[in-house]
């Protein structure tokens, strides 16, 4: 008799999940000399241990502590780029501006980027059929808790001037319910962080509005101010030109506003 399996609303674990995590770990540690000491098998075991045999709606940050410990990494605290709803451009930027880092440029972020995973209570099986959806099922699922944990730690580590890239094409440029809005903003430490600088990325070619005056940006400014941190905001009117100028700062067209 086939065992009854819980049906969740979200997609199941990414196929070949264990192999993908292990392969990514090996690749990352080869490319980043400061992480060469990391034992990728131990990393996988700790990752697996966080969710295997556990109810996928009862995951806690503590479950991920062994993985966090193994993935401890020092990034320059004044070179952190946060992002919200504009991951691709943020990653394109740090690929060019190599001294800046998004969460996905760290080992733990790199391992989990774009992946889904969950297990089942009391079995050692990975659930490839379905996993809990944050809204429809539960918020304390393996993926959400992982990102909440690593995002909190990443924000807590930041110092000096922290940058955040925001999507100016969305109805809520700053969204309190995003990981940035619900976790990272509230874990920036004012004893270390002097300023949060928002880069609002424009979508339309002819969009010359000052999106820094958007009500949701004012909301972000308010939260940051309440945390005793300065806030500044810049419009990036031409993201294509912005990237081009990061690549070639000497270009004569790069002195004008982007």
């Amino acid at each position: 008799v086939p065992r009854w399996r819980q049906q969740w609303s979200g997609p199941g674990t990414t196929k070949r999940f264990p192999e993908t995590v292990l392969a990514r770990c090996v690749k990352y540690t080869e490319i980043h000399p400061e992480m060469r000491h990391v034992d990728c098998q131990s990393v996988w075991d700790a990752f697996k241990g966080a969710f295997i045999s556990k109810h996928p709606c009862n995951i806690t940050e503590e479950d991920y502590q062994p993985l966090m410990k193994l993935g401890t990494q020092t990034v320059p605290c004044n070179k952190i780029l946060l992002w919200s709803r504009i991951k691709d451009l943020a990653h394109q930027f740090t690929q060019v501006q190599r001294d800046m880092f998004t969460l996905e440029d760290t080992l733990l972020g790199y391992l989990a980027d774009d992946l889904t995973w969950c297990g089942e209570f009391n079995t050692s099986k990975i659930n490839y059929q379905s996993c809990p959806d944050w809204r429809k099922d539960c918020s304390n699922n393996p993926v959400s808790v992982f990102w909440k944990t690593v995002s909190r730690r990443f924000a807590e580590a930041a110092c000096d001037v922290v940058h955040v890239m925001l999507n100016g094409s969305r109805s809520k440029i700053f969204d309190k319910n995003s990981t940035f809005g619900s976790v990272e903003v509230h874990n920036l430490q004012p004893e270390k962080v002097q300023t949060l600088e928002a880069w609002v990325i424009h979508g339309g070619r002819e969009d010359s509005r000052d999106l820094c005056q958007d009500p949701t940006i004012k909301e972000l400014e308010s939260i940051i101010s309440k945390r005793n941190i300065q806030f500044s905001c810049k419009n990036i009117y031409r993201p294509d030109k912005f990237l081009q100028c990061v690549k070639n700062p000497e270009d004569s067209s790069c002195t004008s506003e982007i």
């Epitope: 909190r152 004012p190 004893e191 308010s222 005793n228």
Partner: antibody
Framework: QIQLVQSGPELKKPGETVKISCKAS????????MNWVKQAPGKGLKWMGW????????TYAEEFKGRFAFSLETSASTAYLQINNLKNEDTATYFC????????????????WGQGTSVTVSS | ETTVTQSPASLSVATGEKVTIRCITS??????MNWYQQKPGEPPKVLIS???TLRPGVPSRFSSSGYGTDFVFTIENTLSEDVADYYC?????????FGGGTKLEIK
């Protein structure tokens, strides 16, 4: 325990300057921003602005730009409000208040207030 | 600037009765509303912070609800010690703005 202690009452003439102090104790001064709130006699509360206790950068509500200045003496855990060229309508009680925050939005609020400093402007 | 309209300006109730104060904001402020109590000659005291959160040490007879533009503050079983002015404060965007206040008296 946490306390914000403000300087005593002031009686001033129009055109003069007043400087009110707000001394914090019982917590790390540089950790929390300091707000200033005005209350005219028999009237409600008005947020004047805040000062970043790390950087010393002030932010003023539109109505309080110009004659009003927030400053700090960090070594003494003290915030100051200075009002220049005093006018009769500046007669009020002025409060300092710390903006508290935690790692969740529900913790954010002006939690500790000074006892208030009464400023009377009269010729 | 977000304006905050508070009502009523004053009210008088018997002890044990329920008190309801309302604040309406001119813009959507999510649940970034705070409620303060001010007794004569004293500074305001926070009762409820953002997210309709009762502050530590504040009696549970005080509560609030609301989201967006419409907010309600309630005192169940009012006591004589609740005589005070009550203010709402929106902290969603600067400049932060207070409601005009409500003077609570006991009959």
């Amino acid at each position: 325990q946490i306390q914000l202690v403000q300087s005593g009452p002031e009686l001033k003439k129009p055109g003069e300057t007043v400087k009110i102090s707000c001394k914090a104790s019982g917590y790390t001064f540089k950790k929390y921003g300091m707000n200033w709130v005005k209350q005219a006699p028999g009237k409600g509360l008005k947020w004047m602005g805040w000062i970043n206790t790390n950087t010393g950068e002030p932010t003023y509500a539109e109505e309080f730009k110009g004659r009003f200045a927030f400053s700090l003496e960090t070594s003494a855990s003290t915030a100051y409000l200075q009002i220049n060229n005093l006018k009769n309508e500046d007669t009020a009680t002025y409060f300092c208040a710390r903006w508290y925050y935690g790692s969740t939005p529900s913790s954010y609020t002006m939690d500790y207030w000074g006892q208030g400093t009464s400023v009377t402007v009269s010729s | 600037e977000t304006t905050v309209t508070q009502s009523p300006a004053s009210l008088s109730v018997a002890t044990g009765e329920k008190v309801t104060i309302r604040c309406i904001t001119s813009t959507d402020i999510d649940d970034d509303m705070n409620w303060y109590q001010q007794k004569p000659g004293e500074p305001p005291k926070v009762l409820i912070s953002e997210g309709n959160t009762l502050r530590p040490g504040v009696p549970s007879r005080f509560s609030s609800s609301g989201y967006g533009t419409d907010f309600v503050f309630t005192i169940e079983n009012t006591l004589s010690e609740d005589v005070a002015d009550y203010y709402c404060l929106q902290s969603n965007n600067m400049p932060y703005t207070f409601g005009g206040g409500t003077k609570l008296e006991i009959k």
